[in-house]
Amino acid sequence: DITPSVPPASYHPKPWLGAQPATVVTPGVNVTLRCRAPQPAWRFGLFKPGEIAPLLFRDVSSELAEFFLEEVTPAQGGSYRCCYRRPDWGPGVWSQPSDVLELLVTEELPRPSLVALPGPVVGPGANVSLRCAGRLRNMSFVLYREGVAAPLQYRHSAQPWADFTLLGARAPGTYSCYYHTPSAPYVLSQRSEVLVISWEDSGSSDYTRGNLVRLGLAGLVLISLGALVTFDWRSQNRAPAGIRP
């Protein structure tokens, strides 16, 4: 029963491979890899890429085989595939391999990035979208705001990222995010670097206020000058004939 790590092309339909409790776990957890064939099989094999022979066998007259990985270590993480055989297929013949299952055994998930879309500067009344991006699909993402103990928003995402919308008026502040596996046993990521969201050029309002004052003063000066010119003109119109300025 020595076979290549990915058995030769076969016309027998591939099985499905899944992991319980999850494909991302912390070290020490017991993981069950379940290989389900679309028809009853006689023998199931669990394969790892680059290895000559199946890692494990299960002889079961059934459509389902379970491979038990006890108290997994990070070294047991990686890619797995399974195949099955039926007695009427002849020696060495396996089904097509299942799709690859990636098992990740880690204490902590990689740190996500947090960016603002379209940018970290918010105009009056405009909303801003924060994207928390990790490396894994089907994770739960959590957004935090500095100074607020409870999470601000949760999102479960099939993509390796999640978008959080902030309403313009409340947007400015300091944010961070992290992600975790959607179900127990939970594996958490590190927190992202903080992201500061600010009003559109916070200094510009001061300049505007100053300019308004200057414009007002200039207006007053012009009005005053206008009044003086008018007064002078009227005075001259009342003067005796023969006298000119």
């Epitope: 016309y11 339909p13 591939k14 099985p15 499905w16 389900r36 064939a37 679309p38 059934s62 459509e63």
Partner: antibody
Framework: QVQLKESGPGLVAPSQSLSITCSVS????????VHWVRQPPGKGLEWLGV???????NYNSALMSRLSISKDNSKSQVFLKMNSLQTDDSAMYYC????????????WGQGTTLTVSS | QIVLTQSPAIMSASPGEKVTMTCSAS?????MHWYQQKSGTSPKRWIY???NLASGVPTRFSGSGSGTSYSLTISSMEAEDAATYYC?????????FGAGTKLELK
Amino acid sequence: QVQLKESGPGLVAPSQSLSITCSVSGFSLTSYGVHWVRQPPGKGLEWLGVMWAGGSTNYNSALMSRLSISKDNSKSQVFLKMNSLQTDDSAMYYCALQKGYGNYFDYWGQGTTLTVSS
Amino acid sequence: QIVLTQSPAIMSASPGEKVTMTCSASSSVNYMHWYQQKSGTSPKRWIYDTSNLASGVPTRFSGSGSGTSYSLTISSMEAEDAATYYCQQWSSDPLTFGAGTKLELK
């Protein structure tokens, strides 16, 4: 959408052979398995066999010696051939689609009636 | 081969009544699947992998069980539920069906 449609001779004499065609649309025969199931009048369902996407077959061992399933991928057709027919082979013959890894039938054809009688 | 025994063979229920039918396997199976068939029509996938409802199946239906004992339950019978229900396994060759439970409206 997915459709399966059976067509057959309707009436066959005892000891003769049967050929039924299942014409499919909405999916490729190179992707999924197609099964044959029959149902005698007023009775339950009996599985006959399956033609897998890759061209391999499984048969009900009780009928294996009389059964043959083949297909033509380009015409999207699966064929059931059965010889040495007896009156108790009279039934409604269905083809059914198995889409995924689950060992059940996602879609069924409307069926074709076969009567074995002299 | 695995023999699936469905009981009762025939039953009747009034609208709103709870209905339970069973499927007993002669050997342990991993999953049980159920089909609904109305007179003159082909079967329809109804419940798959023991407890999952097929698309379009009302939520009043449910499936449960393990090993050799499985059941289909209707929480509140409706007129459109009158049909014959078949259980099916393929944990072992050959693929087999139960003889069916015919559910009639009282």
